[in-house]
């Protein structure tokens, strides 16, 4: 990886970087690795002991407009007999991602980056038991 | 790009799709502030498909630090606390968007990048292939 030359700052000299108005950043939304595909095990959402469903949220003022969220199907976990065991808990696993939001103020348009929490799937956990004195 | 509904009273000069390059505010809005307070960071130990978290750092990326999951076992933990190999621990993977400095080292110039991260693990019934 390139190391800045002596005398430069960590960042490139401004003349070698695109000009950007103060308080903003330039963002190219042509995605690197756009065509990468998730190679997750087949239909794990149904085979899991903490199964989940997917719902697609759609927002035309967001990029990407489509965000998929998972919801655990049960409070408990599915045992070897295929029955729900409520002595265990199905819990959501979440991950942060970035989206670009388009905002309309009158006839002008501005863009804002947002951190969004996505529920990715569920896992089965032993519950935390709080003992009441 | 995606289609944007526009105020009908506005001039019709603007493209309905997101432009290829946009100027965005430096302050990144956090939609996560009011998330579920029950959200726990110890699931990785309490899960029947426990995982370890590995630190991945890249100063040219935003966020620079991402913690990735790796399942601890091939099988799942049963009620006795032993690994049951009749079940499988598998990673839950997710494509997320991050920012990549482009050109490198430029403070306020980025490109969106899609990366695949393992977020946690879940316990699944294995797919059994019967040999004829």
């Amino acid at each position: 990886r390139k190391i800045p030359k002596v005398g430069h700052t960590f960042f490139q000299k401004p003349e070698s970087c695109p000009p950007v108005p103060g308080g903003s950043m330039k963002l190219d939304i042509g995605i690197i690795n756009e065509n990468q595909r998730v190679s997750m095990s087949r239909n794990i959402e149904s085979r899991s002991t903490s199964p989940w469903n997917y719902t697609v949220t759609w927002d035309p003022n967001r990029y990407p407009s489509e965000v998929v969220q998972a919801q655990c199907r049960n409070l408990g976990c599915i045992n070897a007999q295929g029955k729900e065991d409520i002595s265990m808990n199905s819990v959501p696993i979440q991950q942060e991602t970035l989206v670009v939001r388009r905002k309309h103020q009158g006839c002008s348009v501005s863009f804002q980056l947002e951190k969004v929490l996505v529920t990715v799937g569920c896992t089965c956990v032993t519950p935390v038991i709080h003992h009441v004195q | 790009g995606i289609t944007i509904p526009r105020n009908p009273g506005c001039p019709n000069s603007e493209d309905k799709n997101f432009p290829r390059t946009v100027m965005v505010n430096l302050n990144i809005h956090n939609r996560n502030t009011n998330t579920n307070p029950k959200r726990s960071s110890d699931y990785y130990n309490r899960s029947t498909s426990p995982w370890n978290l590995h630190r991945n750092e890249d100063p040219e990326r935003y966020p620079s630090v991402i913690w990735e999951a790796k399942c601890r076992h091939l099988g799942c933990i049963n009620a006795d606390g032993n690994v049951d190999y009749h079940m499988n621990s598998v990673p839950i993977q997710q494509e997320i968007l991050v920012l990549r400095r482009e050109p490198p080292h430029c403070p306020n110039s980025f490109r969106l990048e899609k990366i695949l991260v393992s977020v946690g693990c879940t316990c699944v019934t294995p797919i059994v292939h019967h040999v004829a």
Partner: antibody, heavy 121, light 106 residues
Framework: EVQLVQSGAEVKKPGSSVKVSCKAS????????IHWVRQAPGQGLEWIGV????????FYNQKFDGRATLTADKSTSTAYMELSSLRSEDTAVYYC??????????????WGQGTTVTVSS | DIQLTQSPSSLSASVGDRVTITCSAS?????IYWFQQKPGKSPKRWIY???ELASGVPSRFSGSGSGTDYTLTISSLQPEDFATYYC?????????FGQGTKLEIK
């Protein structure tokens, strides 16, 4: 105002454990990792490891792996460092310091005031 | 482990002097960080990512270097600059610090 306030000085016997706390305020706790660094009397700085309060992830300097345990409580914005099987050479000032997860080139920007741990029989 | 060797270990200098502290790494690293510490106090981030001055650090301080050799320079020493300075690398685990350079009044 960003503050990392650590628990008070401790005197411990060899073989015992110590748990030092670090209460954070003035920023979003889960946006930053907490790193722990120690400094023996008259000596330099030594990195112990890192805890990510958001994911619960930890990574240790191998020298401390198995003896140090780093945890965090998101509900109270407090990080903890527990060191077990104490020996006299663990006598040091222990510091917590924060590290921005999003833009890591900033490094360890704010430090706690330090907690003196004395191990003596 | 990457060893960071600071030189000199201690340095006596006068107000107004130009002072250079060097930090040599046993392997090539991406960036160096410098901390200032005064007796009985916590370290303070002084220079980050090799070149950037932390908030409140006077412009008489500068950082430079690449690969294995890095320097912290004070163009004109002031009374408040007398302290111990540590270099730090986080390019490779475990993160390490130099042994420190104690800057004393002559």
């Amino acid at each position: 105002e960003v503050q990392l306030v650590q628990s008070g000085a401790e005197v411990k016997k060899p073989g015992s454990s110590v748990k030092v706390s670090c209460k954070a305020s003035g920023y979003t706790f889960t946006d930053y990792e907490i790193h722990w660094v120690r400094q023996a009397p008259g000596q330099g700085l030594e990195w112990i490891g890192v805890n990510d309060p958001e994911s619960g992830g930890t990574f240790y300097n191998q020298k401390f792996d198995g003896r140090a345990t780093l945890t965090a409580d998101k509900s109270t914005s407090t990080a903890y460092m527990e060191l077990s099987s104490l020996r006299s050479e663990d006598t040091a000032v222990y510091y917590c310091t924060r590290y921005y997860r999003y833009e890591s080139f900033y490094g360890m920007d704010y430090w706690g005031q330090g907690t003196t741990v004395t191990v003596s029989s | 482990d990457i060893q960071l060797t600071q030189s000199p270990s201690s340095l006596s200098a006068s107000v107004g002097d130009r002072v250079t502290i060097t930090c040599s790494a046993s392997s090539s690293i991406s960036y160096i960080y410098w901390f200032q510490q005064k007796p009985g106090k916590s370290p303070k981030r002084w220079i980050y990512a090799t070149f950037e001055l932390a908030s409140g650090v006077p412009s008489r301080f500068s950082g430079s270097g690449s690969g294995t050799d890095y320097t912290l320079t004070i163009s004109s020493l002031q009374p408040e600059d007398f302290a111990t300075y540590y270099c730090h690398q986080r390019s490779s685990y475990p993160w390490t610090f130099g042994q420190g350079t104690k800057l004393e009044i002559k």
